[in-house]
C-alpha cells in the first residue's frame, strides 16, 4: 500500500537558526521515509531537506539549516513520502519567509515611573539580537497588577532600529505594582516570539483616591444619644499600595454648621454619639501628598420615615460564587449597600459591606465566606443621600450535617400516646438550614417507625403506641447535606391511664 499523501504542511522560519516544516500523517503503518523538496532564492535554487535517513524515517518534521536560508525570500515546499510500495507526493506549498518568521523575545531591562508624570510607566527593552535589522517589529505588551491573574494587552509597532527601545504605558493606577512582559514579531509575520522575562515596576504615589463610607445605626441610649458606628475603606478602584497616614472626620446637625465637631483617627472605624436630629458626616483620608476627595454620609433623624423599595430577594449558589439578586419597585434607585456577617448567637466578629452600582445583584466568591456558617445578608437602597429600608436574607455557601442533634424529652406519657419536645439546635451547630425533623421510635424488640415534621415544629404527639411498652426514641435534624440524630431517650407507656385509674377508684 502506498503511503498516505502528506498534508497539512506547516512551516516556520526561526530567524537565523532554521526553517522547519511539519506535516501529517505523523505516523504510518509501514516504515515510511520522507524527502522534503524546497525551492528558495525566489525559485532560483532547489534542494532537499538535509536530515539523515536515521532521523528522517517515520518522523514528520524536517529542518533546513544555514547557510542556505536566505531572507527575504519565497520558498516552495513539497513533501515526498516513500515506502516499499512507492512514492506519494504532497501538493506544492508556498511560503513567504517574512510571514512565517519567528524571532527571539525582546529583553525588558527597566520598568520605571517618570518623575512628575502620573499613572505612567516607561518600559525600556533591548530589541532581540536575532531579528532582521531593517524590519519593522510589532509588539504586544502584557501587563497586570501584581496581585491580579488577568493580563491586559497593548499592541504597537516600532520602526527604528535603535537597539534600546521604549514605550510609555499610560492610564494606569497610581502607586500600583505592575508586572510587564513583552513579545515581538516582524510586522508581516504570523508567528510571535515567546514572552520576555517578566519585569515589575511601580507607578508614582498620589494623594489618596477616595473612600467608601458606611454606618451601622444602633438603638438610642437611655439619655437619648444614638451610637452610630462609622466605617470606611479605600474606594473600589483605589491603588492596592495606597497607604493613608490618617483620617479626618467632621460632622454636624443639618442646618447647623456652628456645631461642627472634628475627629482625627488612624483607624478605619469610629463610633459617634449623635442626637436625634439629622446629621451630616464627612471623612477624608490623607497622606504626604494630600487629601482624598470627601466621602459624605447623611444620618437620618431618629423619627424619619425611610423609604422601602426592595420587594423580594433571592440568594443562589453557582459553582464558585454566591449570588444575591433583588427586585425593586423604584427604577430610579441604582445604588445599593450590601452588608453581610455571620449569624452567630454572640456579637458578630466580622462585619463586611460593599457598594453596588447599576446592578440589582451582588456576587461574592464562595471562598471568601466560611462553609457551614450562616450569613445574614442585608441590602439597603441608596437614593442620592437617602438610605432606604433594608431587605435581609440568610445564606450558606456550603451546608453540612448538623454538628449535634436535637436535645429531646418525652412529656405527657400516656397509655398509647406520648408528647415529644425538642430544643432548636444552637446556630453554631446547625451547619445549614434545618429543613425538617424526623422522629424515630421503636418498641423493645419491635419495628422502627418514623415521622417527619417541618422545621418550625418543636413538639409532636405520637399516638397508637402499645400500652405498658418500653420505647426508645431519637429526633434527627436534617439540612440539605443530611441529618444528625439527637440524644436517644427511653420511655414506657402506662398500663392504664391516670384518668381511667382514678375513675375506677371512685366507684
Amino acid at each position: 500500500v502506498l503511503p498516505a499523501k502528506p498534508e497539512n504542511i506547516s512551516c516556520i522560519f526561526y530567524y537565523e537558526e532554521n526553517f522547519t516544516c511539519t506535516w501529517s500523517p505523523e505516523k504510518e503503518a509501514s516504515y515510511t521515509w520522507y524527502k522534503v523538496k524546497r525551492t528558495y532564492s525566489y525559485g532560483y535554487k532547489s534542494d532537499i531537506c538535509s536530515t539523515d535517513n536515521s532521523t528522517r524515517g517515520n518522523h514528520a518534521s524536517c529542518s533546513f539549516l544555514p547557510p542556505t536560508i536566505t531572507n527575504p525570500d519565497n520558498y516552495t515546499i513539497q513533501v515526498e513520502a516513500q515506502n516499499a510500495d512507492g512514492i506519494m507526493k504532497s501538493d506544492i506549498t508556498y511560503w513567504n519567509l517574512d510571514a512565517i518568521m519567528k524571532i527571539e523575545p525582546p529583553e525588558i531591562f527597566s520598568v520605571k515611573s517618570v518623575l512628575g508624570i502620573k499613572r505612567m510607566l516607561q518600559i525600556k527593552w533591548i530589541r532581540p539580537v536575532l531579528a532582521p535589522h531593517s524590519s519593522t517589529l510589532k509588539y504586544t505588551l502584557r501587563f497586570r497588577t501584581i496581585n491580579s491573574a488577568y493580563w491586559m494587552e497593548v499592541n504597537f509597532t516600532k520602526e527604528d532600529i535603535d537597539r534600546d527601545e521604549t514605550y510609555n504605558l499610560t492610564e494606569l493606577q497610581a502607586f500600583t505594582e505592575y508586572v510587564m512582559t513583552l513579545r515581538c514579531a516582524p510586522a508581516e509575520s504570523m508567528f510571535w516570539s515567546g514572552w520576555s522575562q517578566e519585569k515589575v515596576g511601580t507607578t508614582e504615589e498620589e494623594a489618596p483616591y477616595g473612600l467608601d463610607l458606611w454606618r451601622v445605626l444602633k438603638p438610642a441610649m437611655v439619655d437619648g444619644r444614638r451610637p452610630v458606628q462609622l466605617m470606611w475603606k479605600k474606594a473600589t478602584g483605589a491603588p492596592v499600595l495606597e497607604k493613608a497616614l490618617g483620617y479626618n472626620i467632621w460632622y454636624f446637625p443639618e442646618n447647623n454648621t456652628n456645631l461642627t465637631e472634628t475627629v482625627n483617627t488612624t483607624n478605619q472605624t469610629h463610633e459617634l454619639y449623635l442626637g436625634g436630629k439629622t446629621y451630616w458626616v464627612y471623612v477624608v483620608s490623607y497622606n504626604s501628598l494630600g487629601e482624598s476627595p470627601v466621602a459624605t454620609l447623611r444620618i437620618p433623624a431618629l423619627n424619619e420615615k425611610t423609604f422601602q423599595c426592595i420587594e423580594a430577594m433571592q440568594a443562589c449558589l453557582t459553582q464558585d460564587q454566591l449570588v444575591v439578586e433583588w427586585q425593586s419597585s423604584a427604577p430610579e434607585v441604582d445604588t445599593w449597600m450590601v452588608e453581610w456577617f455571620p449569624d452567630v448567637d454572640s456579637e458578630p466578629s466580622s462585619f463586611s459591606w460593599e457598594s453596588v452600582s447599576q446592578a440589582r445583584n451582588w456576587t461574592i466568591q464562595k471562598d471568601e465566606l466560611k462553609p457551614l456558617w450562616c450569613y445574614n445578608i442585608s441590602v439597603y437602597p441608596v437614593l442620592r443621600d437617602r438610605v432606604g429600608q433594608p431587605y435581609s436574607t440568610q445564606a450558606y455557601v456550603q451546608e453540612g450535617i448538623p454538628s449535634a442533634g436535637p436535645v429531646t424529652q418525652a412529656d405527657s406519657i400516656g397509655v398509647k400516646t406520648v408528647t415529644i419536645t425538642w430544643k432548636e439546635i444552637p446556630k453554631s451547630k446547625r451547619n445549614g438550614f434545618i429543613k425538617n425533623y424526623t422522629i424515630f421510635y421503636q418498641a423493645e424488640d419491635g419495628k422502627e417507625f418514623s415521622k417527619t415534621v417541618n422545621s418550625n415544629i418543636l413538639q409532636y404527639r405520637l399516638e397508637s403506641l402499645t400500652r405498658r411498652t418500653s420505647y426508645s426514641l431519637q429526633v434527627m435534624a436534617s439540612t440539605n447535606a443530611g441529618g444528625t440524630n439527637g440524644t436517644k431517650i427511653n420511655f414506657k407507656t402506662l398500663s392504664i391511664s391516670h384518668h381511667h385509674h382514678h375513675h375506677h377508684h371512685h366507684h
Partner: antibody, heavy 118, light 112 residues
Framework: EVQLVESGGGLVQPGRSMKLSCAAF????????MAWVRQAPTKGLEWVAS????????FYRDSVKGRFTISRDNVKSILSLQMDSLRSEDTATYYC???????????WGQGVMVTVSS | QFTLTQPKSVSGSLRSTITIPCERT????????VSWYQQHLGRPPINVIY?????PSEVSDRFSGSIDSSSNSASLTITNLQMDDEADYFC???????????FGGGTKLTVL
C-alpha cells in the same frame, strides 16, 4: 501578458565589449530572479548568468566569470549583460529569461544574436 | 558538479507515445527539481514541465514528467504524438556546486 524584449546584439570583434539589454513587461520585475541563457548555433542551451531580485547577488558560469557583468534596474524594469573581452566561443543567441517560483525559467525573450568575429 | 545526459535524438510515429530520459551523472536526481523545455527551430524555449512533474496550465496534458531514483534519471513522456511536437527538448536542474542551472545537451524529437 509577460514579455521580455532583448536588444543590443550584433557583430563584435574579439577582445571588444558589448552590452545586451532586456526590457521586462507585464509582471513585477523586482519580485523575480533573472537570467541570461545562450545557445551557440546548432548547439544546446547554456546558462550564462543570473541575478537576485534586488541585484545584490550575482551568479556566473565559470567561462564568463570576470568578463561578463549582469545587472538590473528595478525602477526601469531592465536587465543588462555587460560583456567584455569577448571571444569567438561567446558567439550565440542570447536569451533573457525569468526564473519562475519553482526552479524553472518560465518566460523567455525572443533572443538576440551576438557574433564575435574578426 | 554534475551533468545531465540526454539522447541526441528520439523518434516516434504519429499518435504514439515516446519517453525522453535525462540522466544525472553524480548526486541524486531527486535532490534538485528537474524542468523540461521545448524549442522549435528558430524560436525561444518554452517551459513544459517544472518541479519534476508539474505542468504549466497552458501546456497540453499529453506532456508529463517523472523521476526514477533507481536509474537516477528524469523522463519526459509525450503521448498521442502530434506533428507539432517535433522540436528539441532540454532537461534542466539546479547545481549547488556552480550555484546555477545546468541544461542537458538536448534531444531532437522526430515525428514519423
Amino acid at each position: 501578458e509577460v514579455q521580455l524584449v532583448e536588444s543590443g546584439g550584433g557583430l563584435v570583434q574579439p577582445g571588444r565589449s558589448m552590452k545586451l539589454s532586456c526590457a521586462a513587461f507585464g509582471f513585477t520585475f523586482n519580485n523575480y530572479y533573472m537570467a541570461w541563457v545562450r545557445q551557440a548555433p546548432t548547439k544546446g542551451l547554456e546558462w550564462v548568468a543570473s541575478i537576485s531580485t534586488g541585484g545584490g547577488n550575482t551568479f556566473y558560469r565559470d567561462s564568463v566569470k570576470g568578463r561578463f557583468t549582469i545587472s538590473r534596474d528595478n525602477v526601469k524594469s531592465i536587465l543588462s549583460l555587460q560583456m567584455d573581452s569577448l571571444r569567438s566561443e561567446d558567439t550565440a543567441t542570447y536569451y533573457c529569461a525569468r526564473h519562475g517560483t519553482i526552479a524553472a525559467m518560465d518566460y523567455w525573450g525572443q533572443g538576440v544574436m551576438v557574433t564575435v568575429s574578426s | 558538479q554534475f551533468t545531465l545526459t540526454q539522447p541526441k535524438s528520439v523518434s516516434g510515429s504519429l499518435r504514439s507515445t515516446i519517453t525522453i530520459p535525462c540522466e544525472r551523472t553524480s548526486g541524486d536526481i531527486g535532490d534538485n527539481y528537474v524542468s523540461w523545455y521545448q524549442q522549435h527551430l528558430g524560436r525561444p524555449p518554452i517551459n513544459v514541465i517544472y518541479a519534476d512533474d508539474q505542468r504549466p496550465s497552458e501546456v497540453s496534458d499529453r506532456f508529463s514528467g517523472s523521476i526514477d531514483s533507481s536509474s537516477n534519471s528524469a523522463s519526459l513522456t509525450i503521448t498521442n504524438l502530434q506533428m507539432d511536437d517535433e522540436a528539441d527538448y532540454f532537461c534542466q536542474s539546479y547545481d549547488s556546486n556552480i550555484d546555477g542551472p545546468v541544461f542537458g545537451g538536448g534531444t531532437k524529437l522526430t515525428v514519423l
